[in-house]
C-alpha cells in the first residue's frame, strides 16, 4: 500500500504520500483554530506508471494506454486514498470547543 | 459539474473531462474484445485552482495552501469522479459472451 508506513521510509519517485506540515495561521490564515497550531496534512505526488495502485478499471486501462502510447497526455494521477480526521480546539468567545474535522490527513495514495 | 455536458461544450483549461477514444486492438493490444472496436474512455486533466470541484476538506485545504503559497508543489489533481460501465462482446471459442466492464468510461471529474 502507498501509505505513510511505506512512503515515509522509502525514497519513492512514483506515486506516494509525502509529508506536508500546514500551519493554520501562517499557511491558511485560519485564526480561529486554537490547537493544534498546525498539522501534517500530507499530499500525494509522483508518476503513475502502469498498474501502480490502480484505483479502477479505467485507471488500469489509461495506464496501459499511456504505456503503449508514450506520447499521450492522458495518464492516471496520484491522489489521496485513505484520509483521517483531525481533532481541533477552537474558542467561541472564551468558551473552548472541540471539533473533529473530517478528511484532513492523507494516510495513503492511489493512481486514479 | 465538471461533466461531459459541460466540458465537451466549453473550452475549459482547468480540470475537466476530455474526450479520449481508445481502440481496443491498436491502443491496448486487446484482441479478445470483438465489439465494440473501441470506445470513448475519456480522461481528466487540467489545473485544479483553489475550490474547483474540491472533493474533500483536504483538497480544499490543499488548494487554499497552494493559493497562499504559490511556490508549493503540493496541489490537488484532476481525477475521475463518475464512471460508467461498458458492455462488450467477446468470444469463448465460437460462443459469444456479453460482459459489462465496470468503471470504464469517465463521465465527470473532480479535484482530489
Amino acid at each position: 500500500a502507498l501509505d505513510t508506513n511505506y512512503c515515509f521510509r522509502n525514497l519513492e519517485e512514483n506515486c506516494c504520500v509525502r509529508p506536508l506540515y500546514i500551519d493554520f495561521r501562517q499557511d491558511l490564515g485560519w485564526k480561529w483554530v486554537h490547537e493544534p497550531k498546525g498539522y501534517y496534512a500530507n499530499f500525494c505526488s509522483g508518476p503513475c506508471p502502469y498498474l501502480r495502485s490502480a484505483d479502477t478499471t479505467h485507471s488500469t486501462v489509461l495506464g496501459l494506454y499511456n504505456t503503449l502510447n508514450p506520447e499521450a497526455s492522458a495518464s492516471p494521477c496520484c491522489v489521496p486514498q485513505d484520509l483521517e480526521p483531525l481533532t481541533i480546539l477552537y474558542y467561541v468567545g472564551r468558551t473552548p470547543k472541540v471539533e473533529q474535522l473530517s478528511n484532513m490527513v492523507v494516510k495513503s495514495c492511489k493512481c486514479s | 459539474a465538471l461533466d461531459t455536458n459541460y466540458c465537451f461544450r466549453n473550452l475549459e483549461e482547468n480540470c475537466c473531462v476530455r474526450p479520449l477514444y481508445i481502440d481496443f486492438r491498436q491502443d491496448l493490444g486487446w484482441k479478445w474484445v470483438h465489439e465494440p472496436k473501441g470506445y470513448y474512455a475519456n480522461f481528466c486533466s487540467g489545473p485544479c485552482p483553489y475550490l474547483r470541484s474540491a472533493d474533500t476538506t483536504h483538497s480544499t485545504v490543499l488548494g487554499l495552501y497552494n493559493t497562499l503559497n504559490p511556490e508549493a508543489s503540493a496541489s490537488p489533481c484532476c481525477v475521475p469522479q463518475d464512471l460508467e460501465p461498458l458492455t462488450i462482446l467477446y468470444y469463448v471459442g465460437r460462443t459469444p459472451k456479453v460482459e459489462q466492464l465496470s468503471n470504464m468510461v469517465v463521465k465527470s471529474c473532480k479535484c482530489s
Epitope: G29, K31, G93 | L51, T57, V61, T67
Partner: antibody
Framework: EVQLVESGGDLVKPGGSLRLSCVAS????????ISWVRQAPGQGLEWMGG????????NYAQRFKGRVTLTADTSTNTVYMELSNLRTEDTAVYYC?????????????WGQGTLVTVSS | EIVMTQSPASLSLSQEEKVTITCRAS???????LAWYQQKPGQAPKLLIY???SRAPGVPSRFSGSGSGTDFSFTISSLEPEDVAVYYC?????????FGQGTKLEIK
C-alpha cells in the same frame, strides 16, 4: 476590494421561511468567519450566528436555535441563512459581516443589508 | 447573556468638542473582547475600535477606546460634522454576541 452582498430579502407571510444569501469577494473566504446580524426598523443590532465556511461549523444565538440554519458554499463564496417559522417581529434588515478571524469577534466588513418584511 | 448598557442614549455637542460614550457590561469581559461601531442613516455599521482600544485600519486618530472588565469608554477627541451617527458597543467574550442599545450623536 472586500465586498459582501446580501440578497433574498422579501415580503413573507407569518409562518413562512426564507433563504438569504451573502456573496463574498475580495478576500480569502475560506480563511474567515461570517456572521449574520439583524436590525429591526429604528432598533439596535442583534447577532444571530456565525459560520466557518470551509468546515461548515456554525454557532447560533440561543434564541434562534432551531429556527436559523447557516451554511456555506466555498465554491461560490456564498453563505446562506435559512430562517423558518417567520414572525412579524422578524421584520428587519439582515446583514452579513466578516469577523476579524475568530468565531466571536469584531466585524470589520459588512454587507449593505437585505430587507425582510413579515406581514400577512 | 451579557447585557451591554450604553450611556447616554443621545447627546448633542458642538463641533470640535470632546465626545465620551460609556458602555457597561453585566459581567466582566476581560480586557479585549469589546468593539465600537459607527452607523450612519441607511448604512451598515462600520468598525471603529476592536480589542477595547485598537483602531481599525483607516479610522482617524480622533477616535479612541479604553477600559477593561465591565467598564469601557469611547472618545472622539474633536467632534466633526461627519461624525453624526449612532454609535454601538459590542461584546464578543461570550455567546451570543450582544450590542449596546446605541448612542445617537448630533451636532448643536
Amino acid at each position: 476590494e472586500v465586498q459582501l452582498v446580501e440578497s433574498g430579502g422579501d415580503l413573507v407571510k407569518p409562518g413562512g421561511s426564507l433563504r438569504l444569501s451573502c456573496v463574498a469577494s475580495g478576500f480569502t473566504f475560506s480563511s474567515n468567519v461570517i456572521s449574520w446580524v439583524r436590525q429591526a426598523p429604528g432598533q439596535g443590532l442583534e447577532w444571530m450566528g456565525g459560520v466557518i465556511p470551509i468546515v461548515d461549523i456554525a454557532n447560533y444565538a440561543q434564541r434562534f436555535k432551531g429556527r436559523v440554519t447557516l451554511t456555506a458554499d466555498t465554491s461560490t463564496n456564498t453563505v446562506y441563512m435559512e430562517l423558518s417559522n417567520l414572525r412579524t417581529e422578524d421584520t428587519a434588515v439582515y446583514y452579513c459581516a466578516r469577523t476579524l478571524g475568530l468565531v466571536l469577534d469584531a466585524m470589520d466588513y459588512w454587507g449593505q443589508g437585505t430587507l425582510v418584511t413579515v406581514s400577512s | 447573556e451579557i447585557v451591554m448598557t450604553q450611556s447616554p442614549a443621545s447627546l448633542s455637542l458642538s463641533q470640535e468638542e470632546k465626545v465620551t460614550i460609556t458602555c457597561r457590561a453585566s459581567q466582566s469581559l476581560g480586557s479585549s473582547y469589546l468593539a465600537w461601531y459607527q452607523q450612519k442613516p441607511g448604512q451598515a455599521p462600520k468598525l471603529l475600535i476592536y480589542g477595547a482600544s485598537s483602531r481599525a485600519p483607516g479610522v482617524p486618530s480622533r477616535f479612541s477606546g479604553s477600559g477593561s472588565g465591565t467598564d469601557f469608554s469611547f472618545t472622539i477627541s474633536s467632534l466633526e460634522p461627519e461624525d453624526v451617527a449612532v454609535y454601538y458597543c459590542q461584546q464578543y467574550a461570550d455567546s451570543p454576541i450582544t450590542f449596546g442599545q446605541g448612542t445617537k450623536l448630533e451636532i448643536k
